[in-house]
């Protein structure tokens, strides 16, 4: 019988304790928000917000500029000064709640927890390959704003998500804020609103459309806005909220809210419940039918998918898919099964389900007893009636009112439970060649870069490494700059190549040469490395 090389177990062919050092920036405080800008002329920047300060970094993560955003009432606050002589509100620290780009101007918009949640607009001024911020403009007109009607009150101290959409020659801010009774009473930022930036950058247009949790539900019904994004003709918000207005408020589930990105109005506001489950291949006795529910979304990202995953999801390559990391409860604590699961929801399918739900509500024959839902936003009603009305009047349309779609969209864990004890806290998905890669940050400060495929019983790692020695959780929001992703952990921002930090964690030549082409790995004497690390012979074709 022929002698064969003993097979190296797959897990033994890599070492995830290998140290990788990636470029980083120490922000001087817990990173609260981060956004990147890439201009057409090779200029780029990273904007990093911490309490009372906004940093501008160059593409090399070196500091270019720093701006004091608080405390409110402090003479050193540079943004506050843009609003003219104060006082403008109670003194206090500014925690950045919103940091977004208006690409048309181009400008950075920052909104904080102080000064009624107002925003500041910072025009971007390219200087070589770096970018500077012009003097801030205060997006607040005192005479237009009252506690009960405040178009310029955008950010909630409890959390706000914003997506900026260009329509014609104007910018619309799609805003979603978490509320409670105290926040709602003090210059209420509203739950969901669409606001239009005024042409003179003095604030937002006075007439804006909004939905808000009704006063009677504010104490018991809180909505957390986890993520927002714009793709195609719609803006989407992802929420974690109580499953029912009347039942136990700790029984949470995840919803997707859809708003039109082409018509800045809320008549076609729709919600759909997203259901993510872990369904092990061999079901244990007593395990729930259809799999164990993971109802609470932790992080999400949408991206076009590569060929292989597209085939597995029965969609076309390049189609947009929403990926979500789900946990069993708010604390994300251990239960039976993995700590985190990842589900994939193709956007076209989401839209189809929503449209079918509208048909069920509005096209006769309407199923008796079908509710319009969203009773926390509007008066209860049955389809096809508008909220709070017993019947449709001739000049109203069933479709012109918000609706919770009666069915949910159910998916199972793409990783088949293989994330195990890992608690995922950040997610960004990219397509590299025809491969779809999930870049995940974890509770213990690691980065996992894993191919998204569902057909395997092991994880295909691009990398799995520790960002530093602090072991602090990687924060939810991830930004992309060129071929790098920016992750925040504690007071640090880290720049991670999307192709992975290197190849040294592959221990055998065979494993090294089987690495994805985009990683650029080759065998280099006795280690796996990239060509730039290899002064001697570097081999991508065969093993010695």
């Amino acid at each position: 019988e022929d002698w064969q090389c003993p097979r190296t177990p797959y897990a033994a062919s890599r070492d995830f304790d290998v140290k990788y050092v990636v470029p980083s920036f120490s922000a001087g405080g817990l990173v609260q928000a981060m956004v990147t800008y890439e201009g057409d002329r090779n200029e780029s920047a990273v904007f990093v917000a911490i309490r009372n300060r906004l940093h501008v970094l160059g593409p090399d993560l070196k500091s270019v500029q720093s701006l004091a955003t608080g405390p409110a009432g402090d003479p050193g606050c540079q943004t506050c000064a843009a609003c003219g002589p104060g006082p403008h509100g109670p003194p206090g620290d500014t925690d950045t709640k919103v940091l977004v780009l208006d690409p048309a101007l181009p400008a950075l918009v920052s909104c904080g927890s102080s000064l009624q949640g107002r925003c500041f607009l910072h025009d971007l001024e390219p200087q070589g390959t770096a970018v500077h911020l012009a003097a801030p403009a205060c997006l607040f007109s005192a005479h237009h704003n009252r506690p009960d009607d405040c178009p310029d009150c955008v950010a909630s101290p409890l959390g706000t998500r914003v997506t900026v959409v260009e329509q014609g020659q104007a910018s619309y801010f799609y805003v979603a804020s978490s509320l409670d009774a105290a926040v709602a009473a003090s210059f209420s930022p509203r739950s969901v609103s669409i606001r239009r930036l005024k042409a003179d950058a003095s604030g937002f247009a006075p007439g804006f459309v909004a939905l808000s949790v009704l006063p009677k539900h504010l104490v018991s019904y809180s909505i957390e806005y986890v993520h927002s994004f714009h793709t195609g003709a719609f803006v989407y918000f992802l929420t974690v909220q109580p499953a029912s207005v009347t039942d136990d408020p700790s029984a949470l589930h995840t919803r997707l809210a859809r708003l039109s990105a082409t018509e800045p109005e809320l008549g076609d506001y729709r919600e759909l419940v997203l259901d993510c489950r872990f369904a092990p291949k061999r079901r244990r006795r007593g395990a729930p039918e259809g799999g164990q529910p993971y109802p609470v979304l932790r992080v999400a990202h949408s991206a076009p998918v590569g060929a292989q995953l597209a085939t597995e999801l029965s969609i076309a390559e390049g189609q947009e898919v929403l990926f979500g990391v789900f946990v069993t409860g708010k604390d994300g604590g251990p239960g039976v099964g993995p700590n985190s699961v990842v589900c994939a929801f193709p956007i076209d399918l989401l839209d189809t389900l929503i449209d079918e739900g509208v048909e069920r509500c509005c096209e006769s024959p309407v199923h008796p007893g079908l509710r319009r839902g969203l009773d926390f936003f509007q008066s209860p009603s049955f389809c096809p009636n508008p909220p709070g009305l017993e019947a449709l009047s001739p000049n109203t349309s069933c479709r012109h009112f918000p609706l919770l779609v009666s069915s949910s969209f159910s998916r199972v864990d793409l990783f088949n439970g293989l994330l195990g004890p890992v608690q995922v806290t950040a997610l960004y998905v990219t397509r590299l060649d025809n491969v779809t890669v999930a870049h995940m940050g974890t509770m213990d400060g690691r980065i996992l870069q894993v191919e998204l495929v569902r057909s395997l019983n092991y994880l295909l790692y691009v990398s799995n490494f520790s960002l530093g020695d602090s072991g602090q959780p990687v924060q939810r929001d991830v930004s992309r700059l060129g071929d790098h992703l920016l992750f925040a952990s504690g007071d640090q921002v880290f720049q991670v190549p999307i192709q992975g930090p290197g190849c040294r964690h592959f221990l055998t030549c065979g494993r090294c040469l089987r690495a994805w082409h985009f990683m650029g790995c080759g065998w280099c004497g006795n280690m796996c490395g990239q060509q730039k690390e290899c002064p001697g012979s570097w081999q991508q074709d065969h093993c010695p």
Partner: antibody
Framework: EVQLQESGPSLVKPSQTLSLTCSVT????????WNWIRKFPGNKLEYMGY???????YYNPSLKSRISITRDTSKNHYYLQLISVTAEDTATYYC???????????WGQGTSVTVSS | DIVLTQSPASLAVSLGQRATISCRAS??????????MNWFQQKPGQPPKLLIY???NQGSGVPARFSGSGSGTDFSLNIHPVEEDDTAMYFC?????????FGGGTKLEIK
Amino acid sequence: EVQLQESGPSLVKPSQTLSLTCSVTGDSITSGYWNWIRKFPGNKLEYMGYISYSGKTYYNPSLKSRISITRDTSKNHYYLQLISVTAEDTATYYCARSKYDYAMDYWGQGTSVTVSS
Amino acid sequence: DIVLTQSPASLAVSLGQRATISCRASEIVDNFGISFMNWFQQKPGQPPKLLIYAASNQGSGVPARFSGSGSGTDFSLNIHPVEEDDTAMYFCQQSKEVPPTFGGGTKLEIK
């Protein structure tokens, strides 16, 4: 100081293509919106279309099948092409910048184009 | 398309007096609490100049003598006191709906 300058032929034959260039100084065409407007001999102004900071275009539907607006960011120029011109396209053509809501705050001096054989 | 009708077509006003030019839109040009009406001045041999945007906001470097007002469908441009240099054509422009459209113009002469 932002300045725009139109250039191109002053005489175009019917059925041919009118091609104009707008050269921009003092601002980058990678921010804001860059418009074309024309004024007919009887003083009537017509909005033609724009190219945005990102290269996105909008065309007046009355011209949609005939108009194209492009740009060259390396030169900071943007361009107008109008195909199959007739005598009705005789006008003064202006390029103009807007930051918001078609409020065009900087204009070129205009270039007069006559369509005639 | 929204049609803008300017009146009068021409206007002669004495030096130092008030000139009022009206612009009526075929449909409401307000949205989000803003009136999407701009006003331009054009002198012979020159390009148009932005005077007023969003119905009542003065363009950069525009003298305070120029003011705009109105909402819905009815708008006006006021010049007070008029100066000799104000001899020009004045155009209104709506930007609520695409395509943006212009009024037919009003010719102002100073007596």
